[in-house]
C-alpha cells in the first residue's frame, strides 16, 4: 500500500481542516488508514482522524482543531496499521479556504431595487470575520448566457442592484462565496442558491411615453 498523491490540506480557520490524498489502488480508507495530527510542541496526545473514501483510491479526512492561531503548525502522520506511509506538516493559516456564507436572501419588496443579504460564516471574534469579501453570482434559469458576477469588496454582507438590470418576468437564482485577501485564501464553496421571480415593471410614465411614441410612428 502506497500513497500516490500526497495529502493536501485546507483550513476553515476556525475548527476544521480537510485533507485529501490518493492511494495507489482501491482502498477502504476508514478501516485501513489513520491520519494522526498534532500541533507542534503540544504535550497532549496526537489526535486521530478516521478518513472517508473519496472515490476508489481517494481519501478525505476532516481534522477537528481548536480555533486557529496564525503561527499554528501541525505534524501529520498517515498510518496503515503499524506502517507509516507518509509524514508531513501543515500550517493552517497558509492554506485557508473560508467557510461558505449562509442564509442568502433576496428582498424584492422595494419595486425597483433588489437587496441580497447573507450571513458572514464566522463569529465576530474570529480574525476572518472582518476580512471577508464576497462574489455574488446571479443567473437566469431560462437563459444560460444571462450569467453575472458582482464583486462585493466592502465588509457588509449585502448587495443592492437595480431590478431593471435583470430581465423582467423570469426566474433568477443567486449564490455567494467568500475569500480573504489577508491570508491569500482560496474561494469558499458557493452558498446554497436561492431563487426568485424578477417581476420588475417599468414605471407608468415610461410605459405611457413609450406607447405614445410608438403611436406616432
Amino acid at each position: 500500500m502506497k500513497v500516490l498523491q500526497e495529502p493536501t490540506c485546507v483550513s476553515d480557520y476556525m475548527s476544521i481542516s480537510t485533507c485529501e490524498w490518493k492511494m495507489n489502488g482501491p482502498t477502504n480508507c476508514s478501516t485501513e488508514l489513520r491520519l494522526l495530527y498534532q500541533l507542534v510542541f503540544l504535550l497532549s496526545e496526537a489526535h486521530t482522524c478516521i478518513p472517508e473514501n473519496n472515490g476508489g483510491a481517494g481519501c478525505v479526512c476532516h481534522l477537528l482543531m481548536d480555533d486557529v492561531v496564525s503561527a499554528d503548525n501541525y505534524t501529520l502522520d498517515l498510518w496503515a496499521g503499524q506502517q507509516l506511509l507518509w509524514k508531513g506538516s501543515f500550517k493552517p493559516s497558509e492554506h485557508v479556504k473560508p467557510r461558505a456564507p449562509g442564509n442568502l436572501t433576496v428582498h424584492t419588496n422595494v419595486s425597483d431595487t433588489l437587496l441580497l443579504t447573507w450571513s458572514n460564516p464566522y463569529p465576530p471574534d474570529n480574525y476572518l470575520y472582518n476580512h471577508l469579501t464576497y462574489a455574488v453570482n446571479i443567473w437566469s434559469e431560462n437563459d444560460p448566457a444571462d450569467f453575472r458576477i458582482y464583486n462585493v469588496t466592502y465588509l457588509e454582507p449585502s448587495l443592492r442592484i437595480a431590478a431593471s438590470t435583470l430581465k423582467s418576468g423570469i426566474s433568477y437564482r443567486a449564490r455567494v462565496r467568500a475569500w480573504a485577501q489577508c491570508y491569500n485564501t482560496t474561494w469558499s464553496e458557493w452558498s446554497p442558491s436561492t431563487k426568485w421571480h424578477n417581476s420588475y415593471r417599468e414605471p407608468f410614465e415610461q410605459h405611457h411615453h413609450h406607447h405614445h411614441h410608438h403611436h406616432h410612428h
Partner: antibody, heavy 119, light 108 residues
Framework: EVQLVESGGGLVQPGGSLRLSCAAS????????MSWVRQAPGKGLVLVAT????????SYPDSVKGRFTISRDNAKNTLYLQMNSLRAEDTAVYYC????????????WGQGTLVTVSS | DIQMTQSPSSLSASVGQRVTITCRTS??????LAWYQQKQGKPPRFLIY???TLAEGVPSRFSGSGSGTEFTLTITSLQAEDFGVYYC??????????FGPGTKLEIK
C-alpha cells in the same frame, strides 16, 4: 469529574530529596500532557517541569534542571516529581496540572502539596 | 526566555465596575496566551486560552483580547466572587513557558 491529588510534600533538610506524586482520575490520563507548577509563599506561579502524554519528552527551567525529574506511570494514572539536592528556595506549594487537549494551557489543577526545605 | 509583565500589579474596584488587566510579553507570542484566576489558598482556575477563548464554565463577563505582545483581560461587570490574583501565561514555542507576576484584584 477530573481530579488531581498531590501527595508527598513535607519538611526536608537542604540537600535532601523528596518524591511528589499526583494521582489522576476522571479522564484518560495517558492522552494528556502534565506539569508541575510551584508557588513560593506570597509569590507567583513558576512552571518547574513538563512531560508529554507518553512520557517521551520532558522539560525543565534552568533553576531545577539536573535536580528535578518528572515522570509518569500511565498504567497507574500517576505523575511524579523526584526532587534532589533541595534548597531553601525550593520551598513552595507544588501543584500538579493537566495540559488542555488542544493547547499548552493548564485546564485542571490539583490542590497542591507544600514542600518546606529548612534545617 | 520570554519575559512577562502585568499591569497594574494590584487594583481595587467596586462590584459592577469594569476592570481591565494588561499583560505584555518581551516578544511576539501571537495568540498563545492563557489567563488564570487564583484565590487565597486555592489552586489557579483556567479562564481563557488563545488570548480570547473562554474556557468551559467561565462566565461571559470575562473576556480576553490582544495578540503579538500586548493582551488584556476584561471583566465587564465585577462580581464579589471575582476577587483574587490574575495571572497570564504564554505557551509559545518549546516548553519554557512562563507566567506573568500576577495582578491582585481587591473588591472595594
Amino acid at each position: 469529574e477530573v481530579q488531581l491529588v498531590e501527595s508527598g510534600g513535607g519538611l526536608v533538610q537542604p540537600g535532601g530529596s523528596l518524591r511528589l506524586s499526583c494521582a489522576a482520575s476522571g479522564f484518560t490520563f495517558s492522552t494528556y500532557g502534565m506539569s508541575w507548577v510551584r508557588q513560593a509563599p506570597g509569590k507567583g506561579l513558576v512552571l518547574v517541569a513538563t512531560i508529554n502524554s507518553n512520557g517521551g519528552s520532558t522539560s525543565y527551567p534552568d533553576s531545577v534542571k539536573g535536580r528535578f525529574t518528572i515522570s509518569r506511570d500511565n498504567a497507574k494514572n500517576t505523575l511524579y516529581l523526584q526532587m534532589n539536592s533541595l534548597r531553601a528556595e525550593d520551598t513552595a506549594v507544588y501543584y500538579c496540572a493537566r495540559f488542555f487537549r488542544f493547547r499548552n494551557a493548564m485546564d485542571y489543577w490539583g490542590q497542591g502539596t507544600l514542600v518546606t526545605v529548612s534545617s | 526566555d520570554i519575559q512577562m509583565t502585568q499591569s497594574p500589579s494590584s487594583l481595587s474596584a467596586s462590584v459592577g465596575q469594569r476592570v481591565t488587566i494588561t499583560c505584555r510579553t518581551s516578544e511576539n507570542i501571537y495568540s498563545y496566551l492563557a489567563w488564570y484566576q487564583q484565590k487565597q489558598g486555592k489552586p489557579p482556575r483556567f479562564l481563557i486560552y488563545n488570548a480570547k477563548t473562554l474556557a468551559e464554565g467561565v462566565p461571559s463577563r470575562f473576556s480576553g483580547s490582544g495578540s503579538g505582545t500586548e493582551f488584556t483581560l476584561t471583566i465587564t461587570s465585577l462580581q464579589a466572587e471575582d476577587f483574587g490574583v490574575y495571572y497570564c501565561q504564554h505557551y509559545y514555542g518549546p516548553p519554557t513557558w512562563t507566567f506573568g507576576p500576577g495582578t491582585k484584584l481587591e473588591i472595594k
